[in-house]
Amino acid sequence: MNGRVDYLVTEEEINLTRGPSGLGFNIVGGTDQQYVSNDSGIYVSRIKENGAAALDGRLQEGDKILSVNGQDLKNLLHQDAVDLFRNAGYAVSLRVQHRLQVQNGPIGHRGEGDPSG
């Protein structure tokens, strides 16, 4: 029997200070560039080596960015989202959704490290 793939979704507030070369990441998504089917959200597609985001260490490729400095990123065109980041100032607060893939074992099988029993 195959295991089931589940996702653990968590949210985090990440405060970044813009470095000499900026925030240090790339994004995909937007109403005109759907990266995930049926989701026009903004996702992190690249973390630049030695950039502000990489040095902070919390933002990851695949994270969904929900808001920037309290401004919701829903229903934005891709370029409008890019411009929002570029104009966000020196101290940038990101509300981020991490989606961690969790592989469950076959039904009836107690996985290693299962606390019950």
Epitope: Q33, V82, F85
Partner: nanobody, 126 residues
Framework: DVQLVESGGGSVQAGGSLRLSCTAS????????MAWFRQAPGKEREFVAA??????YYADSVKGRFTISRDNAKNTMYLQMNSLKPEDTAVYIC?????????????????????WGQGTQVTVSS
């Protein structure tokens, strides 16, 4: 990982034309920021042109002669090269990165890109 394969190079007389293609793997090609660089023997790698979600960029040396474009349905980027000159002789290399930088974009900076092709040779004789 993204694989990039260039084609369309060859030998041509000065004043002639060539169209280079760069075909990429990956289901999200439309999100890629892409560029052409070139490298002549004994010289530094040089930026030629780039295409992003919002526009196109060209080196001054090719402006008005070269045109960068893409066909998202074919996962392919093109470089139409007209009025070729002997100084355009080089290996032409395709580069890509997924997404758009949230910082100011420097199309000529190789660090903007994560993926590189092997290149295709263009030779222009006088």
């Amino acid at each position: 990982d993204v694989q990039l394969v260039e084609s369309g190079g060859g030998s041509v007389q000065a004043g002639g034309s060539l169209r280079l293609s760069c075909t990429a793997s990956g289901r999200t090609f439309s999100t890629y920021t892409m560029a052409w660089f070139r490298q002549a023997p004994g010289k530094e790698r040089e930026f030629v042109a780039a295409i992003t979600w919002s526009g196109t960029y060209y080196a001054d040396s090719v402006k008005g002669r070269f045109t960068i474009s893409r066909d998202n349905a074919k996962n392919t980027m093109y470089l139409q090269m007209n009025s070729l000159k002997p100084e355009d002789t080089a290996v032409y290399i395709c580069a890509a990165v997924i997404g758009s930088t949230v910082d100011s974009y420097s199309p000529s900076d190789p660090l903007e890109y994560d993926y590189w092709g092997q290149g295709t040779q263009v030779t222009v004789s006088s």
